[in-house]
């Protein structure tokens, strides 16, 4: 079978303060079983940006309908961008575990940076 790939097509995303940013992530397989989460940064200090299962992320919405069957689009939108939002964002596939899920594969990351303000 096809091995799962995590596709984040944009290496760099220039955003404007106050606007909404869309971070794209698609997967090539439904397997292995387990969730996709979004993080900013890498390593133990990385920040969880979105987990559909738990947590409260009022500025984050999903691009795809949460009731869509066999979805492979895990893109998100972040509203009301501020300078504190800059950084590199990763979508990460976890393999279902019991009791803990295990990180399986990460996308290559999308760097979010501030672009020039529109004149």
């Amino acid at each position: 079978e096809e091995e799962l790939q995590m596709i984040q097509p944009e290496k760099l995303l220039l955003v404007t303060v106050g606007k909404t940013a869309t971070l794209h992530c698609t997967v090539t397989s439904l397997l292995p079983v387990g969730p996709v989460l979004w993080f900013r940064g890498v390593g133990p200090g990385r920040e969880l940006i979105y987990n559909q299962k738990e947590g409260h992320f009022p500025r984050v919405t999903t691009v795809s309908d949460l009731t869509k069957r066999n979805n492979m689009d895990f893109s998100i939108r972040i509203s009301s961008i501020t300078p504190a939002d800059v950084g590199t964002y990763y979508c990460v596939k976890f393999r279902k575990g019991s009791p803990e899920n295990v990180e399986f594969k990460s996308g290559p990351g999308t760097e979010m940076a501030l672009g020039a303000k529109p004149s």
């Epitope: 079978e1 096809e2 397989s29 439904l30 397997l31 292995p32 079983v33 387990g34 969730p35 996709v36 559909q52 299962k53 999903t62 795809s64 309908d65 949460l66 009731t67 869509k68 069957r69 066999n70 979805n71 895990f74 393999r95 279902k96 019991s98």
Partner: antibody
């Protein structure tokens, strides 16, 4: 049309073994997780085991005794059942998993089931 | 393990009447709940997923509602072919996937 056809059930003595098969057709078998669910006579549904690609999951009641596997080249799901007990007597259904977006799995297609009877 | 409790165990309804089936979860499962119908000697059939989404081909008289810990399956006007056992299943937190004990809808 999705079809799932179980086979391999029968009567076996306590402590014995059986291997169930589920032949799948009508969908891209290798792309989906697959599950075994059982139903004891006159009782409700009980999840047994699920397999993704290499990832496998078991109910506590069968862990260490049952092994789920798949052969994607044959579009076939298997359940190897060892050290069988009287309480394993049930109709065993194979089911295709379907995932809701960012969430978990439910079962959108089921086979007709195969009866396993464990009795001396 | 999340426990699903279905009530009532048996529901006696006349054809054409409304049937309301309940499924209560021991903890929050958000909308990660499915409903199945099973007739004697047959395999279960998916009716509803994501608590409220009707599976393709399922008649509009079947509807699901609720979220969190309280869920309802409603059959607006029972037809003869609807007399069966109905199970709920949660997929929020697994393993294990868990099913309710079932509600038998019988002819009054």
């Amino acid at each position: 049309e999705v079809q799932l056809l179980e086979s391999g059930g029968g009567v076996v003595q306590p402590g014995g073994s059986l291997r169930l098969s589920c032949a799948a057709s009508g969908f891209s078998f290798s792309n989906f997780a697959m599950t075994w669910v059982r139903q004891a006579p006159g009782e409700g549904l009980e999840w047994v085991s699920t397999i993704g690609s290499g990832d496998t999951y078991y109910a506590d009641s069968v862990k260490g005794r049952f092994t789920i596997s798949r052969d994607n080249s044959k579009n076939t799901l298997y359940l190897q059942m060892n050290s069988l007990r009287a309480e394993d007597t049930a109709v065993y259904y194979c089911a295709k998993d379907s995932t809701v977006s960012w969430s978990g799995d439910f079962f959108d297609y089921w086979g007709l089931g195969t009866l396993v009877t464990v009795s001396s | 393990e999340i426990v699903l409790t279905q009530s009532p165990a048996t529901l006696s309804v006349s054809p054409g009447e409304r049937a309301t089936l309940s499924c209560r979860a021991s903890q929050n499962v958000k909308n990660d709940l499915a409903w199945y119908q099973q007739k004697p000697g047959q395999a279960p059939r998916l009716l509803i997923y994501a608590a409220r989404i009707r599976e393709t081909g399922i008649p509009a008289r079947f509807s699901g509602s609720g979220s969190g810990t309280e869920f309802t399956l409603t059959i607006s006007s029972l037809q003869s072919e609807d007399f069966a056992v109905y199970y709920c299943q949660q997929y929020y937190d697994w393993p294990p996937f868990t099913f309710g004990g079932g509600t038998k809808v019988e002819i009054k």
